[in-house]
Interface confidence: low
């Protein structure tokens, strides 16, 4: 009785921002759930949390300094990460826990999404021109 999670294998964050959609084999409508995004092969860093309760507004937060937002679909949660650094290129795993109504459910570990962060291409300063083209 595990929820299956589907994620894109790879995403590129060109402008230091990315939308990562976690699709679940479970309808989150009228459920109390905690969806989270974890960084690293060992999922050591909890990047962002989306907490849903049918009687309250969606709560989205990060306790690890990430700038994140979340959107809820019937069977998905989309994490919107901004201000990512190049060194935050890593594998990111979606996790879901359904607390209510019972019984408690969580997911089989997904394959994860490699987020490749490409820094903003800043225009070269006129004082320091880039290499000349032949």
């Amino acid at each position: 009785n595990k929820i299956l999670v589907k994620q894109s294998p790879m995403l590129v964050a060109y402008d230091n921002a990315v939308n990562l959609s976690c699709k679940y084999s479970y309808n989150l409508f009228s459920r109390e759930f905690r969806a989270s995004l974890h960084k690293g092969l060992d999922s050591a860093v909890e990047v962002c949390v989306v907490y849903g309760n049918y009687s309250q507004q969606l709560q989205v937060y990060s306790k690890t300094g990430f700038n994140c937002d979340g959107k809820l679909g019937n069977e998905s949660v989309t994490f919107y990460l901004q201000n990512l650094y190049v060194n935050q290129t890593d594998i990111y795993f979606c996790k879901i826990e359904v607390m209510y109504p019972p019984p408690y459910l969580d997911n089989e570990k997904s394959n994860g999404t490699i987020i490749h962060v490409k820094g903003k291409h800043l225009c070269p300063s006129p004082l320091f021109p880039g290499p000349s083209k032949p």
Partner: antibody, heavy 119, light 107 residues
Framework: EVQLVESGGGLVKPGGSLRLSCAAS????????MNWVRQAPGKGLEWVSS????????YYSDSVKGRFTISRDNAKNSLYLQMNSLRAEDTAEYYC????????????WGQGTLVTVSS | EIVLTQSPATLSLSPGERATLSCRAS??????LAWYQQNPGQVPRLLIY???NRATGIPVRFSGSGSGTDFTLTISSLEPEDFAVYYC?????????FGQGTKVEIK
């Protein structure tokens, strides 16, 4: 073939106790949430109790809370319902039912065991 | 808890006829409604889950529809083995609850 076979029912006096068992076969028992559902004679169905695959979460209907205890032994592929402080209104056929891949959908069901509470 | 009211209590029909059973919830359960069949002396059998999805092995003559508070089970052409009691069950809110049943009997 998935099979659920209940046992342990019988006649008991009000205030007495009984322990029901459900033997499972034909599927990986330890992977599934299991439930007890009852049916009073000539009446409809009533969900009684639920236990998660690893026994970490147990739930009861208000009508049996504090009197009934659900448990399971995954090594023995068995589900149990310990019923204490039995009342006349607990008289019913008790079915064990597997919760499939969809939460709180009961499929399949065992053949049931009859519990009669009477003085 | 959510109360499910089934109607009619008894439906008298002949084989080959169409049967329409109703289940009304006291508050919305979205599409989280199932139907079970119980033949005399038998155990309940899952027919339909989440309002309109047929369970494995269930004949196409059984169909379900509805959402929110009003649901319908339709048997397009009654076979002799379809004369039984039918229960609806919701899983949209805790605890799961069943309707009181509709008996489909031979006219």
């Amino acid at each position: 073939e998935v099979q659920l076979v209940e046992s342990g029912g019988g006649l008991v006096k009000p205030g007495g106790s009984l322990r029901l068992s459900c033997a499972a076969s034909g599927f990986t028992f330890s992977s599934y949430t299991m439930n007890w559902v009852r049916q009073a004679p000539g009446k409809g169905l009533e969900w009684v109790s639920s236990i998660s695959s690893s026994s970490s979460h147990k739930y009861y209907s208000d009508s049996v809370k504090g009197r009934f205890t659900i448990s399971r032994d995954n090594a023995k592929n068995s589900l149990y319902l310990q019923m204490n402080s039995l009342r006349a209104e607990d008289t019913a056929e008790y079915y064990c039912a597997r919760e499939g891949d969809i939460v709180l959908i009961f499929d399949p069901w065992g053949q049931g065991t009859l519990v009669t509470v009477s003085s | 808890e959510i109360v499910l009211t089934q109607s009619p209590a008894t439906l008298s029909l002949s084989p080959g006829e169409r049967a329409t059973l109703s289940c009304r919830a006291s508050q919305s359960v979205s599409s989280y409604l199932a139907w079970y069949q119980q033949n005399p002396g038998q155990v309940p059998r899952l027919l339909i889950y989440d309002a309109s999805n047929r369970a494995t092995g269930i004949p196409v003559r059984f169909s379900g529809s509805g959402s929110g508070t009003d649901f319908t089970l339709t048997i397009s052409s009654l076979e002799p083995e379809d004369f039984a009691v039918y229960y609806c069950q919701q899983r949209g809110n805790w605890p799961p609850t069943f309707g009181q049943g509709t008996k489909v009997e031979i006219k």
